[in-house]
């Protein structure tokens, strides 16, 4: 008997969709495998006879629930199929925004960049496919415990009127209100303030 | 069922125009997310372009950008293809395709009606 592939997941980040397994102990030789998808009722070949542990599916439609499954192989015997269920808008992670962040005296301007999404032309990001898309920011005084969260309205945001020659950090997540549904953070980027503009009366 | 109809089609010189067409035939293209593919001969599909509805946002593949140009006439319930600067290798038939739920723009996966294809032919 060859055994079945062990600890079958989907990773899924952004629609870039992997999945992935581990190979079982197997005392006669090295294994393969054969991963597979449910299409219009027949299992359609995705990848064969790899000896890899993962399997692209990203060009998966982005709805709908799809079954995808895999085996193990050795010479002419094979494991049961192991299935998964997996349905890309909702189960796939939202990874981190992108951010610029530039200083203008005692402010922070801020523009974030929705995720790209594997398989899509470079102009159709995570915003597209998501209409309640939003972003969270949270920014904090470098060194400090104290967290301030703010939710922008458009692509961009100025923190104002902060600390001179003070150090902040901001970091940004997508978010989607209508699913309750956060993305990663972005690694957080640290700027020091300058001079307060005001001027002197 | 949803029939899509696409014209426009034809034969041209490098460097010439055409305007492809897309047309629901006794529907409204009233759909998320309209695009253009084509499959050059020996070839599989290639995602062109697509339009948004919510947003009017267009989106173009890198062989095309500058070149083509998508748009939408609500009125007319159509869609055009505007191909500029053609060149030899455009040469392909073009599809049209409607997607229900506009979640995906490039990936012929992310559409589910199709019309049945017009040739360009770009050659001197």
């Known amino acids: 008997m060859v055994p079945p592939p062990e600890n079958v997941r989907m990773n899924s980040v952004n629609f870039k969709n992997i999945l992935q397994w581990e190979s079982p102990a197997f005392a006669k030789g090295n294994l393969t495998f054969t991963a597979q998808y449910l299409s219009y009722r027949i299992f359609q070949d995705k990848c064969m006879n790899t000896t890899l542990t993962e399997c692209d599916f990203s060009s998966l439609s982005k709805y709908g629930d799809h079954t995808l499954r895999v085996r193990a192989e050795f010479a002419d015997e094979h494991s049961d199929w192991v299935n998964i269920t997996f349905c890309p808008v909702d189960d796939t992670i939202i990874g981190p925004p992108g951010m610029q962040v530039e200083v203008l005296a005692d402010s922070l301007h801020m523009r974030f960049l929705a995720p790209k999404i594997e398989n899509e032309y470079e102009t159709w990001t995570m915003k597209n496919v998501y209409n309640s898309w939003t972003y969270n920011v949270q920014y904090w005084k470098n060194g400090t415990d104290e967290k301030f969260q703010i939710t922008p309205q458009y692509d961009f945001e100025v923190l104002r009127n902060l600390e001179p020659w003070t150090t902040y950090c901001v970091q940004v997540r997508g978010f989607l209100p209508d699913r309750n549904k956060a993305g990663e953070w972005s690694e957080p980027v640290c700027e020091q303030t300058t001079h307060d503009e005001t001027v002197p009366s | 069922e949803v029939q899509l109809v696409e014209s426009g089609g034809g034969l041209v010189q490098p460097g010439g125009s055409l305007r492809l067409s897309c047309a629901a035939s006794?529907?409204?293209?009233?759909?998320?997310?309209i695009g253009w593919f084509r499959q050059a001969p020996g070839k599989g599909l290639e995602g062109v372009s697509c339009?948004?509805?919510?947003?009017?946002?267009?989106h173009y593949a890198d062989s095309v950008k500058g070149r083509f140009t998508i748009s939408r006439d609500n009125s007319k319930n159509t869609v055009y293809l505007q191909m500029n600067s053609l060149r030899a290798e455009d040469t392909a038939v073009y599809y049209c395709?409607?997607?229900?739920?506009?979640?995906?723009?490039?990936?012929?996966?992310?559409?589910?009606?199709w019309g049945q294809g017009t040739q360009v032919t770009v050659s001197s």
């Open positions: 395709a409607a997607s229900l739920y506009g979640l995906g723009c490039k990936s012929e996966a992310d559409y589910d009606y």
């Open positions: 006794g529907n409204s293209l009233d759909y998320p997310t």
């Open positions: 339009i948004s509805a919510s947003d009017g946002s267009t």
